[in-house]
């Protein structure tokens, strides 16, 4: 805590300007009026205050707004934002997308690198959380903004949080935004994507839905296999194993089209490995790829899960 001392004669700040960078901490405390600082917050960003000087400025704002800063101040915090703790930010009510963008831009400046950071800093995560909760749902404009700054943002949300994403927002999602999503997250996102893209024709639909297919059930994969989609192996390898297992050899062949030859290179990896174990060797042989491990001729396949359900 900075001691309260009288401001020396002639040093009282009439505006937030560059002369203040030559003030000692105690002079800033004594000579800068908090209300003046709040109204001229946008100037701070262009003046290279030291870390210690910014402590004093933050302290002044904290005293002026003990219940949390108003949005008019928050929007102009500039690099002072990076001194805020998650506890500070939880007191804020941020409703403007412009404010969110301004602060994400500041943080991006701090973390500039060839790739945008995959996961936000704690104070940024708190800011986003406050913003989304204030809006009630992750609408398209917000999602557009967040994924532009953090391509991995969607995949940092829990399945429960993802359930608040309306299908209309799915249009803002790019394939790279889903790179780090796990199956549980895709299980939530896939039905929303299916709904969002339902009015598109076959080939266009597949282009849009492709990156969400890690959440697709068997019946949807069967339907896609009838549409000459030529799914690539990378997409196939991300499908749910339980959704792939019931597919027949003919269905997989139709689903992959010319990419079916890639199965050979993946025969030891899931879901291909588990799928091979469920197919008749005769059927696998029709692919002419030399896939081994299928069920030999003459063997009876018992579906034990069905048997358990009946007993």
């Amino acid at each position: 805590e900075v001691e309260k001392t009288a401001c020396p004669s002639g040093k009282k700040a009439r505006e937030i300007d560059e002369s203040l960078i030559f003030y000692k901490k105690w002079e800033l405390e004594a000579c800068v009026d908090a209300a003046l600082l709040a109204t001229q917050m946008d100037r701070v960003n262009a003046i290279p205050f030291t870390y210690e000087q910014l402590d004093v400025l933050k302290h002044k704002l904290d005293e002026l707004y003990p219940q949390g800063y108003p949005e008019s101040v928050i929007q102009h915090l500039g690099y002072l934002f990076l001194k805020m703790s998650p506890e500070d930010i939880r007191k804020w009510n941020v409703t403007s997308l412009e404010t969110l963008k301004a602060l994400l831009e500041v943080n991006k400046g701090h973390e500039m690198s060839p790739q945008a950071p995959r996961r936000p800093l704690p104070q940024v995560a708190t800011l986003i959380d406050r913003f989304v909760k204030g809006r009630g749902q992750l609408d398209k404009d917000t999602l557009d903004t967040l994924t532009a700054f953090y391509p991995g943002y969607l995949c940092s949300l829990s399945p429960e949080e993802l359930s608040s994403v309306p299908p209309s927002s799915i249009w803002a999602v790019r394939p790279q935004d889903l790179d780090t999503c796990d199956p549980r997250q895709l299980d939530v996102l896939y039905p929303k994507a299916r709904l969002a893209f339902q009015n598109m024709n076959g080939s266009e639909y597949f282009v849009k839905i492709q990156s969400f297919l890690g959440g697709a059930p068997t019946e949807d994969l069967k339907a896609l296999s009838q549409q000459n989609v030529s799914m690539d192996l990378a997409t196939f390898m991300k499908l749910r194993t339980d959704a792939v297992l019931p597919l027949t050899v003919a269905e997989v062949q139709k689903l992959l089209g010319p990419h079916v030859e890639g199965l050979k290179a993946e025969e030891r990896h899931r879901p291909v490995r588990d799928w091979i174990l469920r197919q008749r060797q005769d059927d696998l042989d029709t692919l002419g790829l030399g896939l081994q491990g299928g069920i030999p001729n003459g063997y009876l396949v018992l579906d034990l899960s069905m048997q358990e359900a009946l007993s």
Partner: nanobody, 120 residues
């Protein structure tokens, strides 16, 4: 990747003027305040001035009467105009972006600098 490239330095006679440029790339230049900083031989860094994204400028009071900072956001370029040059203005001039993390504040991105020598 962030890049700041200064140009325009050289040998100048006392009393003359000079305009330095700084070409920026790899970030949203128009969103950030940018700064000019200099370092004379054997001395520490001296902040010259800065310009906000909207064009508002701030200057070191000791240099205010002789320097002018401007920017062209369309060209991603920052400028420094220096008038009435003196021998003590001899220095390496850098354009930089200032920023803070949760533990410190500093000029976090710099150019390689351009040398200005004031000599007759």
């Amino acid at each position: 990747e962030v890049q700041l490239v200064e140009s325009g330095g050289g040998v100048v006679q006392p009393g003359r003027s000079l305009r330095l440029s700084c070409a920026a790339s790899g970030f949203t230049f128009s969103s950030y305040a940018m700064h000019w900083v200099r370092q004379a031989p054997g001395k520490g860094l001296e902040w010259i001035g800065s310009i906000r994204h909207d064009g508002n400028t701030y200057y070191n009071p000791s240099l205010k009467s002789r320097v002018s900072v401007s920017r062209d956001n369309a060209k991603n370029t920052l400028y420094l105009q220096m008038d009435s040059l003196r021998a003590e203005d001899t220095a390496m001039y850098y354009c930089a972006k200032y920023g803070c993390s949760s533990i410190s504040c500093s000029f976090d991105y710099w150019g390689q600098g351009t040398l200005v020598t004031v000599s007759s």
